[in-house]
């Protein structure tokens, strides 16, 4: 039975040209996290495997940095980066958990940043 829940940064906004940290946290389960995949709609951004390390999709290698932790840092944001992002937690023995983050990239310099999510 899957008992875990994923907490995410939720809906966040950031300025064009800036950077943002995408983070998720899996709680309420003792399942072992084996891998986290970061995806944007139909695209794979990155994979963080607990043992093998990071894979960064070549399409994003100049604008994506691994971490902190299992999170992902998006840099040099453009308005085209606006959209849904998913953290897909592969766990054993539970299976797969998915979290959703909506990022809005604003032209204006008055973009309000969502509260940064901290993993305790």
């Amino acid at each position: 039975m899957m008992t875990g829940t994923i907490e995410t940064t939720g809906n966040i906004s950031a300025e064009k040209g800036g950077s943002i940290i995408l983070q998720c946290h899996l709680s309420s389960t003792t399942a072992q996290v084996t891998q986290v995949n970061w995806e944007q709609q139909d695209q794979l951004l990155a994979i963080c495997n607990a043992d093998l390390g990071w894979h960064i999709s070549p399409s994003f290698k100049d604008r994506v940095a691994p971490g902190p932790g299992l999170g992902l840092t998006l840099q040099s944001l453009t308005v085209n980066d606006t959209g849904e992002y998913f953290c897909i937690y592969h766990t054993y023995p539970d299976g797969t958990y998915t979290g959703r983050i909506f990022l809005e990239v604003l032209e204006s310099s008055v973009a309000e940043h969502g509260a940064r999510f901290q993993i305790p």
Partner: antibody, heavy 119, light 107 residues
Framework: QVQLVQSGAEVKKPGASVKVSCKAS????????MHWVRQAPGQGLEWIGG????????LIHQKFKGRATLTVDKSISTAYMELSRLRSDDTAVYYC????????????WGQGTTVTVSS | DIQMTQSPSSLSASVGDRVTITCKAS??????VAWYQQKPGKAPKLLIY???FRYTGVPSRFSGSGSGADFTLTISSLQPEDFATYYC?????????FGQGTKVEIK
């Protein structure tokens, strides 16, 4: 230039163990993950597992758990794969390969080590 | 485990032919697919990574495409040195898995 040089062919009896080595040169060994892939005669490729050379963390395919052990010796930039309780269907060419920096494809491969299991 | 199914398993072609090999994943793997070439008695060589990126030094006649569950390796004009076996591999999730291979033979 990048090179992965594997140890020589082995002939083993069923139930025995084999340890294959893979000596790396031409790159910073601890910045990469080393993988092992095998190929039975006339068959396709099968991933056994990988090991992060910096931290020594290994990930083994469930099929080989309990039989395969991956290790590294950072001081001599060498990766090892030990397979125990050998069976005749473990007869194969065993390759070590390096996964690219921040990528999960296998960009350099060793020349292969033939392991024959026969009574 | 994710199954990677290649087709055809073998094909005969002539020098100069356009050759297409397909690989179908049993589930969505986004673009986490690589293609390798293997000649008899030799280790595989990386051709294409992340579905469509040509690896360093690989001739431009090789190209990869696809995302999700369907992927294609194309050789635009087959050369004598291209007769070999080709494998796809997914790394979307472990265990990493390979297709069964496609042998390209001389017609």
């Amino acid at each position: 230039q990048v090179q992965l040089v594997q140890s020589g062919a082995e002939v083993k009896k069923p139930g025995a163990s084999v340890k294959v080595s893979c000596k790396a040169s031409g790159f910073t060994f601890t910045e990469y993950t080393m993988h092992w892939v095998r190929q039975a005669p006339g068959q396709g490729l099968e991933w056994i597992g990988g090991i992060n050379a910096k931290f020594g963390r290994q990930l083994i395919h469930q099929k080989f758990k309990g039989r395969a052990t991956l290790t590294v010796d950072k001081s001599i930039s060498t990766a090892y794969m030990e397979l125990s309780r050998l069976r005749s269907d473990d007869t194969a060419v065993y390759y070590c390969a390096r996964s690219s920096y921040y990528r999960f494809d296998l960009d350099y491969w060793g020349q292969g080590t033939t392991v024959t299991v026969s009574s | 485990d994710i199954q990677m199914t290649q087709s055809p398993s073998s094909l005969s072609a002539s020098v100069g032919d356009r050759v297409t090999i397909t690989c179908k994943a049993s589930q969505d793997v986004k673009t986490a697919v690589a293609w390798y070439q293997q000649k008899p008695g030799k280790a595989p060589k990386l051709l294409i990574y992340s579905a469509s990126f040509r690896y360093t030094g690989v001739p431009s006649r090789f190209s990869g495409s696809g995302s999700g569950a369907d992927f294609t390796l194309t050789i635009s004009s087959l050369q004598p040195e291209d007769f070999a076996t080709y494998y796809c591999q997914q790394h979307y999730t472990t265990p990493w898995t390979f297709g069964q291979g496609t042998k390209v033979e001389i017609k």
